[in-house]
């Protein structure tokens, strides 16, 4: 029998390489049974996760899972960093693993590093 706890399906140490100026949707896959929990996104600043209050978010519902989406329209260079989603469920706070966005500045898109380069040389992303 499936657990009726809320579960947030962000992989541990997941990473995305994205281009500044493009739109991007960061998904938090949420499994729940009856009532949809209240979900929020935050951005890590050291050990603190700062809640993203005034950002555009939406829900996408599918048959077995729902997605709480943080919209980047467009992606900006300072969107680089790690994000986490959290769900409030029966007075419990459930936190996802963090997921990291590596933003490449559109100015350097012609010499844009590959995913492999970005994974092994993340300092390329901060120019």
């Amino acid at each position: 029998k499936e657990s009726c706890d809320v579960q947030l399906y962000i992989k541990r140490q997941s990473e995305h390489s994205i281009l500044a100026g493009d739109p991007f949707e960061l998904e938090c896959p949420v499994k729940y049974c009856a009532n949809r929990p209240h979900v929020t996104w935050c951005k890590l600043n050291g050990t603190t996760c700062v809640k993203l209050e005034d950002r555009q978010t939406s829900w996408k519902e599918e048959k077995n899972i729902s997605f709480f989406i943080l919209h980047f329209e467009p992606v900006l260079p300072n969107d680089n960093g790690s994000y986490r989603c959290s769900a409030n469920f029966q007075s419990n706070l459930i936190e996802s693993h963090s997921t990291t966005l590596y933003v490449t500045d559109v100015k350097s898109a012609s010499e844009r590093p590959s995913k492999d380069e970005m994974a092994s040389r993340p300092w390329l992303l901060y120019r």
Epitope: K11, R12, E15, T47, H97, S98
Partner: antibody
Framework: EVQLQQSGAELVKPGASVKLSCTAS????????MYWVKQRPEQGLEWIGR????????RYDPKFQGKATITADTSSNTAHLQLSSLTSEDAAVYYC????????????WGAGTTVTVSS | DVVMTQAPLTLSVTIGQPASISCKSS???????????LNWLLQRPGQSPKRLIY???KLDSGVPDRFTGSGSGTDFTLKINRVEAEDLGVYYC?????????FGGGTKLEIK
């Protein structure tokens, strides 16, 4: 039950390239990370790198950067390891493995593929 | 890179007797999520490695409870309270906290 099926043994010439494959059953690889490990005869284990099949994002041990390329095809639930400019140092058993990306609840290894480098 | 150091290199044990393997890491393996991603594998002769223990002390399904993992930070131990013939092989610790992932050099368990 999660299982991995690796491609057969390879005999390759020095300087050539080879592409190994690893097909998962019992799991959608989008929910996992897949990684490759090298084991030379009578030696220990060396982590080559891993891929997130959901978005193709890879991580490598720097010593395999340029030597190894890991890719994944979610339509066939398969990961690949390409090795280039082969030398005798690359002769080894290459294992692929898959683990649950969310909770680490499983970690399953394939049977390994033997790569022999000889002219 | 995180260096994983295992001891001893070889362990010769009589069936029914206990065995203990040490694994030390050059950096703490405590992750920012509060978990420690330290795994133990067993590679039996002629076979591929198989995970026995993850998150320091959690046993994989089907692994007998004579195996126990313990430790924190940089110091970890695998214990077998009564060695059986099927336990022979090479045991590896490896860390899943930092990139690149790294393995210990292995400990060969022989049956006396």
């Amino acid at each position: 039950e999660v299982q991995l099926q690796q491609s057969g043994a390879e005999l390759v010439k020095p300087g050539a390239s080879v592409k190994l494959s690893c097909t998962a059953s019992g799991v959608n690889i989008k929910d996992t990370y897949m990684y490759w490990v090298k084991q030379r005869p009578e030696q220990g284990l060396e982590w080559i790198g891993r891929i997130d099949p959901a978005n193709g994002y890879t991580r490598y041990d720097p010593k395999f950067q340029g030597k190894a390329t890991i890719t994944a095809d979610t339509s066939s639930n398969t990961a690949h390891l390409q090795l280039s400019s082969l030398t005798s140092e690359d002769a080894a058993v290459y294992y692929c493995a898959v683990y649950d990306g969310y909770y680490e609840s499983f970690d399953v290894w394939g049977a390994g593929t033997t790569v022999t480098v000889s002219s | 890179d995180v260096v994983m150091t295992q001891a001893p290199l070889t362990l010769s044990v009589t069936i029914g007797q206990p065995a203990s393997i040490s694994c030390k890491s050059s950096q703490s393996l405590l992750d920012s999520d509060g978990k420690t991603y330290l795994n133990w594998l067993l590679q039996r002769p002629g076979q591929s490695p198989k995970r026995l223990i993850y998150l320091v002390s959690k046993l994989d399904s089907g692994v007998p409870d004579r195996f126990t993992g313990s430790g924190s930070g940089t110091d970890f131990t695998l214990k077998i309270n009564r060695v059986e013939a099927e336990d022979l092989g090479v045991y590896y610790c490896w860390q899943g906290t930092l990139f690149p992932r790294t393995f210990g050099g292995g400990t060969k368990l022989e049956i006396k």
